[in-house]
């Protein structure tokens, strides 16, 4: 699955929680990438939209069902994380269930933790309810651990 | 470095309206959210609500809704609120305060302006 | 709206004191709660964001523990220069709240 970046132009800033030395994130469809200078917060995140069924179309990257949806909740977690220290998205993966999204959020480390994630996207769901019409429910949330991890640093002020 | 410059103090009179600027530099100014946070005289901090300059959403604690305008200037890298219907609980001093996301908290604070509501 | 509560108002102190504020929030926030000190006429200065990570710039001797309801800034060795008031923010929900401020003076 193509990552999908939030663009901006600011400098990482130096922070603690979860560190790991990972190459800049790239993408196809953004020209410009932020520089990775320091640590990144790795998220998982998994929902239903119980307004929608799951198919086979939604195993086939090359179909206009995974590739809409896809975009749809790309453009959806720009709108809630609006940059500041959201770098993007990856690994989006659709599973039976209604349809269960599973997706992996990085952002710059130490600007948020894992109780703002899970309320910010709580908070979005009527407006995503309207703006893209996909009913969300059953919201999780959870660290993605990095046995690498390095030694936590102290935050430079956001 | 980051930095948020307010405007002077105002003294206006009740029912009237006041416009306070943050003028900000040292960062990407459409990328973070700029949150107005009000404290009356000896009291403590109220946030009001929150604008995101790069496409001009706004968050308003339902206290201020309708009383408050928040508004961004992208081609001066300046925030403003605006203070309509004033009243004399109005008197505070309002802080903006930058921030990451929607919720989150404010490392960066401009220096207050001083609004006084006297008739 | 979350209600957040400090304790205490006020509180005497003499420099190298060990000194502990509380904040108690009304319904479960996670770690989601920040901590800010703010001297007479100037802005607040974050101290301690999502209840225990250090900030750079702001001595050691601040920390911070909890989770849930229960939160406690901590000021190790008290030195003159943080005689100020103190607040709790949390942002686990809107609207943004933050307490009523634990204000120290010197004994």
């Known amino acids: 699955t193509p990552t999908t970046l939030a663009s901006h132009s600011t400098k990482t800033d130096a922070s603690s929680t979860h560190h790991s030395s990972v190459p800049p994130l790239t993408s196809s469809n953004h020209s410009t990438s932020p520089q990775l200078s320091t640590g990144v917060s790795f998220f998982f995140l998994s929902f239903h939209i119980s307004n929608l069924q799951f198919n086979s179309s939604l195993e086939d990257p090359s179909t206009d069902y995974y590739q809409e949806l896809q975009r749809d909740i790309s453009e959806m977690f720009l709108q809630i994380y609006k940059q500041g220290g959201f770098l993007g998205l990856s690994n989006i993966k659709f599973r039976p269930g209604s349809v269960v999204v599973q997706l992996t959020l990085a952002f710059r480390e130490g600007t948020i933790n894992v109780h703002d994630v899970e309320t910010q996207f709580n908070q979005y769901k009527t407006e995503a309810a309207s703006r893209y019409n996909l009913t969300i429910s059953d919201v999780s949330v959870s660290d993605v651990p990095f046995p690498f991890s390095a030694q936590s640093g102290a935050g430079v002020p956001g | 470095q980051v930095q948020l410059v307010q405007s002077g103090a105002e003294v206006k009179k009740p029912g009237s309206s006041v416009k306070i600027s943050c003028k900000t530099s040292?960062?990407?100014?459409?990328?973070?959210?700029m949150n107005w946070v009000r404290q009356a005289p000896g009291q403590g901090l109220e946030w009001i609500g929150q604008?995101?300059?790069?496409?001009?959403?706004?968050n308003y604690n339902a206290k201020f809704k309708g009383r408050v305008t928040l508004t961004a200037d992208k081609s001066t890298s300046t925030a403003y609120m605006e203070l309509s219907s004033l009243r004399s609980e109005a008197t505070a001093v309002y802080f903006c305060?930058?921030?990451?996301?929607?919720?989150?908290?404010?490392?960066?604070w401009g220096q207050g302006t001083l609004v006084t509501v006297s008739s | 709206e979350i209600l957040l509560t400090q304790s205490p108002d006020f509180q005497s102190v003499t420099p190298k004191e060990k000194v502990t504020f509380t904040c108690r929030a009304s319904?479960?926030?996670?770690?989601?709660i920040h901590w800010y000190q703010q001297k007479p006429n100037q802005s607040p200065k974050l101290l301690i964001k999502y209840a225990s990570e250090s900030i750079s710039g702001v001595p050691s001797r601040f920390s911070g523990s909890g989770s849930g309801t229960d939160f406690t800034l901590t000021i190790n060795s008290l030195e003159s220069e943080d005689i100020a008031t103190y607040y709790c923010q949390q942002s686990n929900n809107w609207p943004l709240t933050f307490g009523q401020g634990t204000k120290l003076e010197i004994k």
């Open positions: 040292g960062y990407a100014f459409s990328n973070f959210w």
């Open positions: 305060a930058r921030s990451y996301y929607r919720s989150a908290w404010f490392a960066y």
């Open positions: 319904q479960s926030i996670g770690t989601s």
């Open positions: 604008i995101y300059p790069g496409d001009g959403d706004t």
